[in-house]
Each structure stands twice: as structure tokens, then as C-alpha cells.
């Protein structure tokens, strides 16, 4: 039995997969900030998690996916206000009793040290210093991401 949050996440991900392939993104669009091979967009208003997920989708992006602790730290360095929380693309899957990224993968327990409970209707937020489990209905800000296409340098044989 999937929760409404899980259904929303799956629906949006499937609709994103159905869309036509777009040409690779070489530079971050206006208002987006580059962090390594990603473009990040930090919201100014607040929303529950599923609305945040939908907003990113309308911008042809997804809620932030964090690969490891190093990427978390670099993202947190962009957050200058200690008091602000941002949704990312991670929520608790009741059916699998585990934290699940919106791309379908599960959280590696070593990646993020989450403060709070792992339970139904819990979603993950980050602040400048920490990672928190919050009720998904909580209205906070969010971070969208777009992947940059890596530019491969052509190697020419010696003439």
C-alpha cells in the first residue's frame, strides 16, 4: 500500500521519464547556481514536500538528490541563514520501511545523519548544519536540481 506522498513522487517521476529527451544542459539557467555538475535553485517561499516536488517538476528539474556527505557539505555551504530549512528529494517509504530518493534508490545509511524519526509521512530537509526528518506536510523551502551535461574534451592524435 503506497502512501499519497509515494504515489505523488512516482507519478511525477514517471511523467518526467515520458517527456522527450532534451538537449544536454551546458550552463546553468538564470537564477540557478552551479554546484559542480549540478544547477541548484533555492526557493524563497514555503510549501509542503509534495508541492515542492511538483514545483521542481514544472521547472524541468527534480528535488535535490544528494550523492554523498561531500555533496551535502557543499550544498550546505550555499545556505547562509542557519534558521532556514529546505526540502530535498528524500522521503520515507512505508511499504519498504526505508528512506527512498525520488529516483527510486534507497538511502545509504552512511550518507546522511538524519535527526528525527523514520516513519510514515516523514520527508527530509536540510539546513546549513544538519539533516532533519520532518512531517511532509510541514511548509518549508525547497531546492530543485538540474544535471549539467559534462563537456568531454576531444583528444586529437598527434599530427
Amino acid at each position: 500500500q503506497k502512501s499519497s506522498i509515494e504515489k505523488c513522487s512516482v507519478d511525477i517521476q514517471q511523467s518526467r521519464n515520458k517527456t522527450t529527451e532534451r538537449p544536454g544542459l551546458l550552463n546553468c539557467p538564470i537564477y540557478w547556481q552551479q554546484l559542480r555538475e549540478k544547477c541548484l535553485l533555492f526557493s524563497h517561499t514555503v510549501n509542503p514536500w509534495n508541492n515542492s516536488l511538483a514545483d521542481c517538476s514544472t521547472k524541468e528539474s527534480s528535488l535535490l538528490l544528494i550523492r554523498d556527505k561531500d555533496e551535502l557539505i557543499h550544498t550546505q555551504n550555499l545556505i547562509r541563514d542557519k534558521a532556514i530549512l529546505f526540502w530535498i528529494g528524500l522521503n520515507f517509504s512505508l511499504s519498504e520501511k526505508n528512506w527512498k530518493w525520488i529516483n527510486g534508490s534507497f538511502l545509504n545509511s552512511n550518507d546522511l545523519e538524519i535527526r528525527g524519526d523514520a516513519k510514515e509521512n516523514s520527508c527530509i530537509s536540510i539546513s546549513q548544519t544538519s539533516v532533519y526528518s520532518e512531517y511532509c506536510s510541514t511548509e518549508i523551502r525547497w531546492i530543485c536540481q538540474k544535471e549539467l551535461t559534462p563537456v568531454r574534451n576531444k583528444v586529437y592524435p598527434d599530427s
Epitope: 538564470i30 537564477y31 541563514d81
Partner: antibody
Framework: QVQLQESGPGLVQPSETLSLTCTVS????????WSWIRQPPGKGLEWIGY???????NYNPSLKSRVTLSVDTSKNQFSLKVRSVTAADTAVYYC????????????WGQGTLVTVSS | EIVLTQSPGTLSLSPGERATLSCRAS???????LAWYQQKPGQAPRLLIY???SRATGIPDRFSGSGSGTDFTLTISRLEPEDFAVYYC?????????FGQGTKVEIK
């Protein structure tokens, strides 16, 4: 009630640096994009650039080599500097709050006229 | 950069009439990131419409926006005396954001 107020000299000598500050009240500067737009007398609007509260900037390429934006979150202020000014930089300069791809320039200062003349 | 061309340059109408202002972009405006502003003499511009069709806070419903891609329209259904002003369109979907040259709506 969000309010923005530009301040700075109304007259600048040619080849000097134009410096303006925008003070924000009713909204924390620790969010949003903070923009500068100018309007030469009797003409249209030209976007100069924005600064995000964490220092991330974006400039109009036509002015990029001469413009610097900065932000002071402790004072809730952001600033504009334009180097090597000429008479073509004479304009009303506006500061504005910008919510980026959600809502663009939703709050503006009343504008300040800067004349470049010797 | 995206060039926005507004037409007509001047629109002469009477109060109560319908005003239709056009804004054409030199290339497609990303995600309909197009805004309309109103400017009265000696004042700063005021945001009317964003996202091509969403009214900004406090804007009367006689103002409406439509369009996508390269062609956008601002409609004022019934002109009030306070609506006579200059109107600018702006795209904010690609850098640098650019403005149209403006349409002046004047009393006939």
C-alpha cells in the same frame, strides 16, 4: 510592507565610479535575488544585474566589465558600483526584489536619478 | 539576448474601452517567463502579470495576460482613468532579462 530605498550621490564625474546602496525593510535580504535596473531619461528599462544573498551574482553582459554588486546581510542592504562612467550612464537607477523564476521584480525602490556630468 | 518588440508604440483610447497590447519575442521565451509592468510618470514600474498570465498581488482582474512561445498579449478589459500609463513586457527566462521598449496608453 516591503520597502526598498536607493541612496547615493546624484551627480558623478565622467570616468569616476557611480556608487549606490539599496536598503531593504519589511523583507529579509537573506532570500530572494536583489536587482538593479536603470532607465535613461525618456527611455526604456535596462536590467543591470542581480545578487543573491549568498553572494552569487549575474550581470548584464553589456555592463559586466564595469559593474560590481555586493550584499551586506547584517545591514539588509545591497550595493551597485559602475566604474568609468560616461554621460550614457545618466539614468534613474532602481533597486528591486526579484523572486526569480517564481515571481520577477515584485517590489521596487522609487528610483534615484544619477547624472554623469563635469 | 532575447529582443522584445512591443506594439503599438502608442494606443489612444477612451475610459471604458478595451486595450490590447502586444509583445513579440525574437526567440521562444522559456517556460512562459514573461511579465508585464505598468509605469506612470515619475514612478517606479509596478508588476502586473508574471508567468505570462498570473496576476500579481493586488492587481485588479481587468488586467489579464496570455500567450506563449514568442507572442504575448496584455489585455485591459475596461480602461479606468488610472490605467493610462506606459506598459513594458519583460522576459526573465534567459540571461540577461530584457524589456520591451514600452507601449504608451493615452487618453483619446
Amino acid at each position: 510592507q516591503v520597502q526598498l530605498q536607493e541612496s547615493g550621490p546624484g551627480l558623478v564625474q565622467p570616468s569616476e565610479t557611480l556608487s549606490l546602496t539599496c536598503t531593504v525593510s519589511g523583507s529579509s535580504i537573506s532570500s530572494y535575488y536583489w536587482s538593479w535596473i536603470r532607465q535613461p531619461p525618456g527611455k526604456g528599462l535596462e536590467w543591470i544585474g542581480y545578487i543573491y544573498y549568498n553572494g552569487n551574482t549575474n550581470y548584464n553582459p553589456s555592463l559586466k566589465s564595469r559593474v560590481t554588486l555586493s550584499v551586506d546581510t547584517s545591514k539588509n542592504q545591497f550595493s551597485l558600483k559602475v566604474r568609468s562612467v560616461t554621460a550614457a550612464d545618466t539614468a534613474v537607477y532602481y533597486c528591486a526584489r526579484d523572486s526569480g523564476p517564481w515571481v520577477p521584480l515584485d517590489y521596487w525602490g522609487q528610483g534615484t536619478l544619477v547624472t554623469v556630468s563635469s | 539576448e532575447i529582443v522584445l518588440t512591443q506594439s503599438p508604440g502608442t494606443l489612444s483610447l477612451s475610459p471604458g474601452e478595451r486595450a490590447t497590447l502586444s509583445c513579440r519575442a525574437s526567440q521562444s521565451v522559456s517556460s512562459s517567463y514573461l511579465a508585464w509592468y505598468q509605469q506612470k510618470p515619475g514612478q517606479a514600474p509596478r508588476l502586473l502579470i508574471y508567468g505570462a498570465s498570473s496576476r500579481a498581488t493586488g492587481i485588479p482582474d481587468r488586467f489579464s495576460g496570455s500567450g506563449s512561445g514568442t507572442d504575448f498579449t496584455l489585455t485591459i478589459s475596461r480602461l479606468e482613468p488610472e490605467d493610462f500609463a506606459v506598459y513594458y513586457c519583460q522576459q526573465y527566462g534567459s540571461s540577461p532579462p530584457t524589456f520591451g521598449q514600452g507601449t504608451k496608453v493615452e487618453i483619446k
